[in-house]
């Protein structure tokens, strides 16, 4: 009986530790996509609707804030698209990029953790164009550090929740 009690306590401890593991999945807020044709920061994301969820992390001022030290897997998926019904592209040669950036408040500094993308020729003769970028990586993050997303040509972003999103989840503690 004692072993049973010990076992169930162990399960509960494991489960509560898992439930406390920080994670976030943020989806683009299509009503507030910034404008610009150069690199701009995307600051408007959903954290609590549709596929978007957050636990033991904070979303504030367009940045995902780490609350617990640890090793985290970070990911971002950005889709760009253009359909002729929305008008013409002013230039057919495009650089479509995403940058995942870490900002430290304690020691004011900013580092690009990941970037992805390509130069594209989107011919005006085509009705529809689409391009997707997915980046992911394993990073040591400290409490208080902030993760943000920058993209080129935000007017071409696909606003769907299954197209443009980013997130993080803690994999293990820092020894």
């Amino acid at each position: 009986e004692k072993a049973m009690v010990d076992g169930s306590w162990l399960d509960l401890a494991k489960r509560s530790k898992l439930e406390a593991q920080p994670f976030a999945h943020l989806t683009i807020n299509a009503t507030d996509i910034p404008s610009g044709s150069h690199k701009v920061s995307l600051s408007s994301w959903y954290h609590d609707r549709g596929w978007a969820k957050i636990s033991n992390m904070t979303f504030s001022n367009g940045k995902l804030i780490v609350n617990q030290d640890g090793f985290y897997y970070l990911y971002a998926n950005i889709c760009f698209r253009h359909h002729e019904t929305s008008g013409d592209l002013a230039t057919e040669y495009l650089q479509l990029m995403v940058y995942v950036t870490k900002t430290s408040i304690k020691i004011p500094s900013s580092h690009t953790l990941m970037k992805g993308g390509s130069t594209k020729y989107w011919s005006g003769n085509s009705e529809f164009h689409f391009y997707s970028i997915n980046v992911g990586g394993f990073f040591k993050l400290r409490s208080g550090e902030e993760i943000s997303i920058e993209v080129s040509n935000p007017s071409l972003l696909d606003p769907d929740q299954d197209a443009t999103y980013f997130g993080a989840f803690k994999v293990r503690d820092i020894d």
Partner: antibody, heavy 126, light 103 residues
Framework: QVQLVQSGAEVRKPGASVKVSCKAS????????IHWVRQAPGQRLEWMGW????????KFSQKFQGRITVTRDTAASTAYMELRSLRSEDTAVYYC???????????????????WGQGTLVTVSS | EIVMTQSPSSLSASVGDRVTITCRAS??????LNWYQLKPGKAPRLLIY???SLQSGVPSRFSGSGSGAEFTLTISSLQPEDIATYYC?????FGQGTKVEIK
């Protein structure tokens, strides 16, 4: 305030060319595209082409391809539309219009014409 | 190529009347539809963009609605200065125009 001022009326013989100017003021000329639209007597408005005033990129209606040239002089904040091999059906009022989508805000030419020139009547007659 | 069709081609109404003009696209164009007012000898004027957004400086009696392939321009209370021809437009295609006159 934003203004587009076009050159005056022109009369041409069939086979000739005409060049219409459109001088912009009140905004950063290079940040917007300029469209050219015409209206022949009793006809609907007809889109002819656009020029991205920033980089000079152009796009034309298939109908005018080969006989239209659109250029711009950024220093003078002026766009020009030249139509060659004129025929009587080209008799129309020609308008320039600004695309409302600023290039600094994105790279899509949205076809919302928020400011127009007063129009230039081109008459083609022998 | 998308074709825009307006109806009616002309209409006559009294001052204060509610006037409705319809524009149909030959295929779905989402909400990428604009309305313009043309008066003889004057520069055309953008009234509505994106199907329902009122252009700055345009009187609130003008409104637009619709999405997909069917759109409407409404003048809630016709004024003498509204005598003009109205055109719908999607990118490179314009409707044939609706001439509005006062009875």
């Amino acid at each position: 305030q934003v203004q587009l001022v076009q050159s005056g009326a022109e009369v041409r013989k069939p086979g000739a060319s005409v060049k219409v100017s459109c001088k912009a003021s009140g905004y950063d000329f290079s940040n917007y595209a300029i469209h050219w639209v015409r209206q022949a007597p009793g006809q609907r408005l007809e889109w002819m082409g656009w020029i991205n005033a920033g980089n000079g990129n152009t796009k034309f209606s298939q109908k005018f391809q080969g006989r239209i040239t659109v250029t711009r002089d950024t220093a003078a904040s002026t766009a020009y539309m030249e139509l060659r091999s004129l025929r009587s059906e080209d008799t129309a009022v020609y308008y320039c219009a600004r695309d409302s989508s600023a290039m600094v805000r994105g790279i899509i030419i949205a076809y919302y014409f928020d400011y127009w020139g007063q129009g230039t009547l081109v008459t083609v007659s022998s | 190529e998308i074709v825009m069709t307006q109806s009616p081609s002309s209409l006559s109404a009294s001052v204060g009347d509610r006037v409705t003009i319809t524009c149909r696209a030959s295929q779905s164009i989402s909400r990428y539809l604009n309305w313009y007012q043309l008066k003889p000898g004057k520069a055309p004027r953008l009234l509505i963009y994106g199907a329902s957004s009122l252009q700055s400086g345009v009187p609130s009696r003008f409104s637009g609605s619709g999405s997909g392939a069917e759109f409407t321009l409404t003048i809630s209370s016709l004024q003498p200065e509204d005598i003009a021809t109205y055109y719908c437009q999607h990118t490179r295609a314009f409707g044939q125009g609706t001439k509005v006159e006062i009875k």
